[in-house]
Amino acid sequence: MNGSEYFVKIQSFLGGAPTEDLKALSQQNVSMDLATFMKLRTDAVLPLTVAEVQKLLGPHVEGLKAEERHRPVRDWILRQRQDDLDTLGLGLQGGIPNGYLVLDLSMQEALSGTPCLLGP
């Protein structure tokens, strides 16, 4: 069974998948469509790296540009380093600038919805 066939079989169970499962799935060459990706739990999507999302979505990663104003895409973009976003070739903006340090202050982030940044 190839990655795409596997994805079709598990698609209906993905809504509540935790981050660890999504990371594992990104190694399976599944090419998740964007509509399915956007139904995932926001808290499960946010920790994924650019490389992991690229592997998870495959060719459909191109659609992030078209959906950049909608959650969870918008929130995920804000968590990524701009340098990493640039590798997607989509002109996505709003990532963390080069030289900034991301502090994982869970309480602050829960309140503000965005990561805490320390400047260079």
Epitope: A35, K39, H60, E62, G63, K65, H70, L88
Partner: antibody, heavy 117, light 113 residues
Framework: EVQLVQSGAEVKKPGASVKVSCKAS????????MHWVRQAPGQGLEWMGN????????YYNERFMSRVTMTVDKSTSTAYMELSSLRSEDTAVYYC??????????WGQGTLVTVSS | DIVMTQSPDSLAVSLGERATINCKSS????????????LAWYQQKPGQSPKLLIY???TRESGVPDRFSGSGSGTDFTLTISSLQAEDVAVYYC?????????FGGGTKVEIK
């Protein structure tokens, strides 16, 4: 003004390969994916695949998976599509098309590839 | 693969009259989160490259005359030319960009009656 200028018409023998170029101008080349679509004479449109010009990652329609290679040269803002093991049914106009998000916002003028013995 | 079925194959309409083209997909093209339908319409005039008219099923591309409109959601979509002009003679294609391989409808040829 966005422009996609493709290479000229080609005549190839069965079993040969063809490489079509698409030179982009009028926009930041690495900010938009490039797609390739073909159209056989008098027929409809068929999506062949797409490529991320920033990373060079490419994705192909499984119908062409073993025969197609898409590449880019960032220094010249040019995309390439190479199709190998040509057969008569590959005779078609090949288009490059720049993505607008997912849809195909700008198209090249097309390159006619004729496969004939 | 998602199958796109267009109807009719050809259409002859008098100048100034309405032309309606239908497109049906074999599965939904709706993103239920963003409410965007991943469907585009293209116009191909004789001897020319295709040109984008509509994306997200109903959003008109800039520069496209407002006599062109798109509607529909899920699996059923329509392209309408409200008042046909001579320069609208072309083949019109729908395309899904929901899941690869991105597929096109077979095309609808619009002619003047």
């Amino acid at each position: 003004e966005v422009q996609l200028v493709q290479s000229g018409a080609e005549v190839k023998k069965p079993g040969a390969s063809v490489k079509v170029s698409c030179k982009a101008s009028g926009y930041t080349f690495t900010n938009y994916w490039m797609h390739w679509v073909r159209q056989a004479p008098g027929q409809g449109l068929e999506w062949m695949g797409n490529i991320n010009p920033s990373s060079g990652d490419s994705y192909y329609n499984e119908r062409f998976m073993s025969r197609v290679t898409m590449t880019v040269d960032k220094s010249t803002s040019t995309a390439y599509m190479e199709l190998s093991s040509l057969r008569s049914e590959d005779t078609a106009v090949y288009y490059c098309a720049r993505s607008g998000g997912l849809w195909l916002a700008f198209w090249g003028q097309g390159t006619l590839v004729t496969v004939s013995s | 693969d998602i199958v796109m079925t267009q109807s009719p194959d050809s259409l002859a309409v008098s100048l100034g009259e309405r032309a309606t083209i239908n497109c049906k997909s074999s599965q939904t093209l709706l993103n239920s989160v963003s409410q965007n339908n991943y469907l585009a319409w293209y116009q191909q005039k004789p001897g020319q490259s295709p040109k984008l008219l509509i994306y997200f099923a109903s959003t008109r591309e800039s520069g496209v005359p407002d006599r062109f409109s798109g509607s529909g959601s899920g699996t059923d979509f329509t392209l309408t030319i409200s008042s046909l002009q001579a320069e609208d003679v072309a083949v019109y294609y729908c395309q899904q960009h929901y899941r690869t391989p991105y597929t096109f409808g077979g095309g609808t040829k619009v002619e003047i009656k």
